[in-house]
């Protein structure tokens, strides 16, 4: 059995502040089980911008429905984009564990924001 | 507001431990990595330990094995476990944000260290 | 480990001038390096990064420059709560995260 890919699509997206960010994520295969995270950076200091499994993010939405077993598109949505939220996002699988550990990486989404149009 | 508050420091021998708190509100703790920065009396500052939101820590040499970074996700407080402390450890212990950026962007006021036979 | 070395030591400078300092690094940092500034019994406070991004909130007095291992910070016009010790720290992706030994900008 092929091993899991985590595909981010889009090398880069640019949006207008105010507007929402649609950052585009799919994995090839339901094994091995655990979640997907996002987050803005690659280092140890990353921050982190979505968690399938708990915490607290108001402005990202799924667009899909993330909780199905079957699902494999984790593609997010961050609403009222501001200039502060430039950069680059990573889409993560991890490997159900205590605690969860990292499987794969996406290559990155680089969300860049225009000026809010006149 | 962003607000961190050391506590935990004090005065003790070389190679005895103590642990330092710091309690963070204003931001979704969870989210990010959070470190200790610290300053000996009159000296610059040296970064001392990181920890990222996954829990994966990082130290400085000059605290390896003997230091221990952790964080209660539930309780929003980091906390620095240090054993066998050394005179050259006397320093203003702060904790700090870290953003994606690997820039330290909230600082607290800081707790003083004092290791003295 | 990425050493930082800043210049001068001590800046005297009078209210209303131009200050400006510099930090070398002893290899490659790009971009990746930020200012902060302290002030006596307080705690760092960011002020640049990037090379040249201010913070929030920071006075548009405050620019850095410099990519590389030569990098810049100027103080357009000095006011009085801006005497204070400066570090500058790189900030590529992995730790361990160093700090320059700083430069006190005190009072002509």
């Known amino acids: 059995e092929e091993e899991l890919q985590v595909i981010q699509p889009d090398k880069s997206v640019s949006v207008a502040a105010g507007e929402s960010a649609i950052l585009h994520c799919t994995v090839t295969s339901l094994i091995p089980v655990g979640p997907i995270q996002w987050f803005r950076g690659a280092g140890p200091a990353r921050e982190l911008i979505y968690n399938q499994k708990e915490g607290h993010f108001p402005r990202v939405t799924t667009v899909s429905e993330s909780t199905k077993r079957e699902n494999m598109d984790f593609s997010i949505s961050i609403s009222n984009i501001t200039p502060a939220d430039a950069g680059t996002y990573y889409c993560v699988k991890f490997r159900k564990g205590s605690p969860d550990t990292e499987f794969k990486s996406g290559a990155g989404t680089e969300l860049s924001v225009r000026a809010k149009p006149s | 507001d962003v607000q961190l508050v050391e506590s935990g420091g004090g005065l003790v021998r070389p190679g005895e431990s103590l642990r330092l708190s710091c309690a963070a509100s204003?931001?979704?703790?969870?989210?990010?990595?959070v470190t200790w920065v610290r300053q000996a009396p009159g000296e610059g500052l040296e970064w001392v330990s990181l920890i990222s939101v996954t829990g994966t820590t990082y130290y400085a040499d000059s605290v390896k094995g003997r230091f221990t970074i952790s964080r209660d996700n539930s309780k929003s407080t980091l906390y620095l476990q240090m054993n066998g402390l050394r005179a050259e450890d006397t320093a203003v212990y702060y904790c700090a944000k870290v953003t994606w950026k690997n820039v330290f962007d909230y600082w607290g006021l800081g707790t003083l260290v004092t290791v003295s036979s | 480990e990425i050493v930082l070395t800043q210049s001068p030591g001590t800046l005297s400078v009078s209210p209303g001038e131009r200050a400006t300092f510099s930090c070398r690094a002893s290899q490659t940092v790009g971009s990746k390096l930020a200012w902060y500034q302290q002030k006596p019994g307080q705690a760092p406070r960011l002020l640049i990064y990037d090379a040249n991004t201010r913070a929030t909130g920071i006075p548009a007095r405050f620019s850095g420059s410099g990519s590389g291992t030569e990098f810049t910070l100027t103080i357009s016009s000095l006011q009085s709560e801006d005497f204070a010790v400066y570090y500058c720290q790189q900030h590529t992706d992995w730790p361990p995260y160093t700090f320059g030994g700083g430069t006190k900008v005190e009072i002509k």
């Open positions: 204003g931001f979704t703790f969870t989210n990010y990595a």
